[in-house]
Interface confidence: low
């Protein structure tokens, strides 16, 4: 099977491709002989053979024609040859050799047939990896050796090669002289031209140019080695927005696809509810009534405002109301749905409404609710209210359709009284305590009576006593002497009990005398 020549090799001489005689100079004439043959693919080739193994002191030279250097700095000589094993040739004693020598000479012009051994410089002694025996020869199994040598730097316009035989049985099947170039290539979307390497150990730095519809991400560079190899690329180009890498090029995104950013990612399919009709789109247009919020990435589907909340339920407790509702059937395709509560205080005619007082409180808040419940407190008693629950999402403000809300109307009840704030101890004795207090700040109606709850502190509320007082003072008797009691008082109106006051602690006297006018703790 024919092995193709690597693309980074440029031939200066290939004996296999020369038609007819090679016409190289052989000196002396009884040395190297040009003979026709065939290569491994049965293609006719010209070879040179010498096999003067019986004679002492062989010095047979073969010189190629003049080879122009072109742009080469370092050249490679590839020799294919067969070499006979001296042990397989009888009676040759010490005259047979299994090596030959390779030489070269640089010159600026063709010297023609003039030949001077001393002008040539030795490249190397060439030995065979595989030599053949007489038996191999009989079977025509000639072991073909390939040897490659480097020469350089070469500076003159051209050169000759020469082969010196010192007593071997050798057939020179092919001679190829080439130099290595780093071939044109596209790497990381940068084009690098054919580059001839330097001969020295240094690398040639080559700047790449970006392919069409791309731009430099980092300046693209590669190093061309002496071996004609492009070494690890540095930097790269990346396809512009609207273009993607396909077959070493940047090609436009097809309709229905887009690419928002410069870079080497692929074009992406337009997200749901968006489309594009042109080649090379950087983003996709939203369908009618669908939108993209400012912070939505181009990769996100276009979305729309949510539908109204559903199933609003109100739970009224005096001057508070808990509102619960269900999520909209359609969130518009977004996860950022929130709810706003619009509170309106209405007269007995539901159409005559005004915004609620700023004192009305919303728990956890009035706007931007993420859950489907809110508690509204500090409403006025016996008042009509309408609550509108708006469902909004990130694109609500971009759309022109009206607000998506659900409304519920309620009427508050009478509120219970607010807590008693302070309790004062008027007198104490061994077994009684007299207390007084002020009416709650917000009685929210006529106070019918007060509930006084007390217990021994050390009992920790496991057993307590409740008594009722019509006014704002009371004397509690049948207490233990020298004992701390905890007291709480709450007011009652027609709307029910208010919340308990905080806990107050008072102590009975240790003996029979009484103490008066002690303030609360």
């Amino acid at each position: 099977e024919l092995i193709p020549q690597p693309s980074n090799e440029v031939n200066l001489l290939d004996s296999k491709t020369i038609q007819g005689e090679l016409g190289w100079i052989s000196y002396p004439s009884h040395g190297w002989e040009e003979i026709s043959g065939v290569d491994e693919h049965y293609t006719p080739i010209r070879t040179y053979q010498v096999c003067n193994v019986m004679d002492h002191s062989q010095n047979n030279w073969l010189r190629t024609n003049w080879v122009p250097r072109n742009s080469a700095q370092k050249i490679y000589v590839e020799l294919k040859f067969t070499l006979r094993d001296c042990n397989s040739i009888p009676l040759v004693l010490g005259t047979c050799k299994e090596t030959f020598n390779l030489y070269y000479m640089e010159s600026d012009d063709d010297h023609g047939v003039k030949f001077r051994e001393h002008q040539f410089t030795k490249i190397d002694t060439i030995a065979a990896d595989e030599s053949f025996t007489q038996m191999d020869l009989g079977d025509r199994i000639l072991k073909l050796n390939t040897e490659i040598r480097e020469v350089g730097p070469v500076n003159k316009k051209g050169f000759y090669l020469a082969f010196q035989d010192v007593g071997a049985c050798v057939a020179l099947v092919s001679v190829r002289v080439y130099f290595k170039k780093c071939p044109f290539t596209v790497k990381n979307l940068a084009m690098f031209p054919d580059t001839v390497p330097m001969d020295s150990q240094s690398l040639v730095e080559v700047r790449g140019s970006c392919v069409n519809n791309s731009k430099e991400e980092d300046p693209p560079r590669m190093y061309c080695s002496t071996e004609g190899e492009w070494l690890v690329p540095i930097g790269k180009c990346s396809c512009n927005a609207g273009y993607e890498e396909r077959g070493f090029m940047c090609q436009a995104c097809r309709p229905g696809f887009y690419k928002a950013l410069d870079g080497n990612m692929k074009c992406a399919k337009c997200p749901p509810h968006s489309s594009t009709q042109e080649d090379g789109s950087m983003n996709c247009r939203c369908e009618n009534n669908y939108f993209r919020a400012d912070k939505d990435p181009p990769s996100m589907a276009c979305t729309r405002p949510p539908s109204s909340p559903r199933n609003v339920i109100s739970n009224i407790n005096e001057t508070s109301v808990i509102l619960d509702w269900s999520w909209p059937l359609d969130t518009g395709g977004r996860k950022d749905v929130t709810f706003n509560i619009i509170c309106k205080k209405c007269g007995w005619n539901i159409k005559q409404c005004e915004p609620c007082s700023p004192n009305v409180r919303f728990l956890p808040r009035q706007f931007g609710l993420t859950n489907t419940t809110v508690t509204v407190t500090d409403l006025l008693a016996h008042t009509n209210y309408t609550f509108e629950i708006d469902a909004v999402n990130g694109v609500s403000e971009l759309s022109s359709p009206p607000r998506q809300f659900a409304a519920v109307s309620i009427t508050t009840n009478q509120a219970a009284p607010s807590p008693v704030l302070t309790i004062k101890k008027d007198r104490t004795s061994r077994n009684s305590i007299s207390l007084s207090w002020q009416e709650p700040e917000h009685p929210n109606g006529i106070i019918l009576d007060y509930e006084v709850k007390y217990y021994e502190k050390q009992e920790q509320e496991t057993s307590y006593t409740i008594l009722r007082a019509r006014g704002t003072n009371v004397t509690i008797s049948s207490l233990k002497p020298d004992t701390i009691y905890v007291f709480q008082i709450r007011a009652r109106t027609a709307a029910g009990y208010g919340t308990n006051s905080r806990k107050f602690e008072f102590e009975t006297s240790p003996d029979s005398f009484s103490i008066s006018g002690e303030s609360s703790q």
């Epitope: 690597p6 240094s202 002496t226 071996e227 004609g228 070494l231």
Partner: antibody
Framework: QVHLKESGPGLVAPSQSLSITCTVS????????VNWIRQPPGKNLEWLGM???????DYNSVLKSRLSISKDNAKSQVFLEMNSLQTDDTANYYC??????????????WGQGTSVTVSS | DIVLTQSPASLAVSLGQRATISCRAS??????????LHWYQQKPGQPPKLLIF???NLGSGVPARFSGSGAGTDFTLNIHPVEEEDAATYYC?????????FGAGTKLELK
Amino acid sequence: QVHLKESGPGLVAPSQSLSITCTVSGFSLTGYGVNWIRQPPGKNLEWLGMIWGDGSTDYNSVLKSRLSISKDNAKSQVFLEMNSLQTDDTANYYCARDRGISYYYAMDYWGQGTSVTVSS
Amino acid sequence: DIVLTQSPASLAVSLGQRATISCRASKSVSASGYSYLHWYQQKPGQPPKLLIFLAYNLGSGVPARFSGSGAGTDFTLNIHPVEEEDAATYYCQHSREFPLTFGAGTKLELK
């Protein structure tokens, strides 16, 4: 005559940093690359990274975040710095010259290696 | 990363016989006419020594009884005839791309 010699601390505490110097002779650091390779006791060789003749570097991606290779051409010295050492970084650390002219990344001359033990 | 699998892990060969060590790459390490696969010899207490570079080129001062062959993903190191001084561990290494990686080694013992 080409010669490379590593010098290191021998013992490093866990989480500390390692600094090894490779001093070369017989060739110029501007013309050849130098590789760093390590070999835990009784185990395989692991390539850490290399510095080229022109000073550019290539690292093993597994260790890149912990590794830094630099050199001083005038002093013929190459430096390996590695941080956040753990016990599994215990190894013989070698510097080795790249074949140079051909840029094959074959290492034709090696130092004798310096033994690094990570232990508290 | 390219993984290099060496086989066998160890082998024992008689003096004068042939030792064959295989190295298989997880993907081709050949490119542009070269096979970027190298062989090293390491003896206990010593650094590795370059035997063969680019699959078949003998390193400096390496005896001709060492030879390398192969292309693509399959490579072989041959030693023939084996001599006493060849008892060592042999590693293959690729340089097709970074990171460079080594095989796990083959220990050659003499029978």
